[in-house]
């Protein structure tokens, strides 16, 4: 197993609709054809898997139907979007990239993107 550099933004603010997007870029040392991308969340001394997708280079990123993540790939960049976020989901979101095929296997872990989620204030009652 070999190490690989992965870059991602330090901070992202989710939209009022609970959507956060960020780019995960990896320095591919070779010509990988099969790549696995995993989004992890670190909070309260625990790391949990948010979502994961395996894709063939040049093809679309496909997450499971019930996943809160969507994404697209372009070269060595993956554009990730996480939906349905609430204030309690604020945390450090880490991009993990694995070059699965062909060998050798490479593993890269980003420094994490701190995603801040602010629940929208409910609209006040209106006379109109």
């Amino acid at each position: 197993c070999k190490a690989m550099h992965v870059a991602q933004p330090a901070v992202v603010l989710a939209s009022s609709r609970g959507i956060a997007s960020f780019v995960c870029e990896y320095a591919s040392p070779g010509k990988a054809t099969e790549v696995r991308v995993t989004v992890l969340r670190q909070a309260d001394s625990q790391v949990t898997e948010v979502c994961a997708a395996t894709y063939m280079m040049g093809n679309e990123l496909t997450f499971l139907d019930d996943s809160i993540c969507t994404g697209t790939s372009s070269g060595n960049q993956v554009n990730l979007t996480i939906q349905g976020l609430r204030a309690m989901d604020t945390g450090l979101y880490i991009c993990k990239v694995e070059l699965m095929y062909p060998p050798p296997y490479y593993l890269g872990i980003g420094n994490g993107t701190q995603i801040y989620v602010i629940d929208p204030e409910p609209c006040p009652d209106s006379d109109f």
Partner: nanobody, 126 residues
Framework: EVQLVESGGGLVQPGGSLRLSCEAS????????IGWFRQAPGKEREEVSC????????NYADSVKGRFTISRDNSKNTVILQMNSLRAEDTGVYYC???????????????????WGQGTQVTVSS
């Protein structure tokens, strides 16, 4: 709240083997840096081995190199310390320790640890 629980200690003859397990209750050890320390009677506690959060890096004290092997089993939420060719000087209480580092350090062992188990006694004697 995560707690570490060691098991697998016991009495073994010189040259024998033991397999120590460090298991997390109340959480997972995924991507945690885990270390094993030991304390012999009348001696200071010393680090025996550690494994990084990714499992790619392992370190060993000179006194156990080639005899001890540390590994992760994330499916069982445990870290194993396989101890072979045990000697009398390996006797002591063995402690599992853990720390979840920043992701930039997941490929390294921790310099210090937040969490300690209660320890398991290992006695090597004929």
């Amino acid at each position: 709240e995560v707690q570490l629980v060691e098991s697998g200690g016991g009495l073994v003859q010189p040259g024998g083997s033991l397999r120590l397990s460090c298991e997390a209750s109340g959480g997972t050890l995924d991507y945690w840096s885990i270390g094993w320390f030991r304390q012999a009677p009348g001696k200071e506690r010393e680090e025996v081995s550690c494994i990084s959060g990714t499992g790619l890096r392992t370190n060993y004290a000179d006194s156990v190199k080639g005899r001890f092997t540390i590994s992760r089993d994330n499916s069982k939420n445990t870290v194993i310390l396989q101890m072979n060719s045990l000697r009398a000087e390996d006797t002591g209480v063995y402690y599992c320790t853990g720390k979840l580092l920043h992701p930039s350090l997941w490929s390294a062992c921790a310099n210090e640890y937040d969490l300690w188990g209660q320890g398991t006694q290992v006695t090597v004697s004929s």
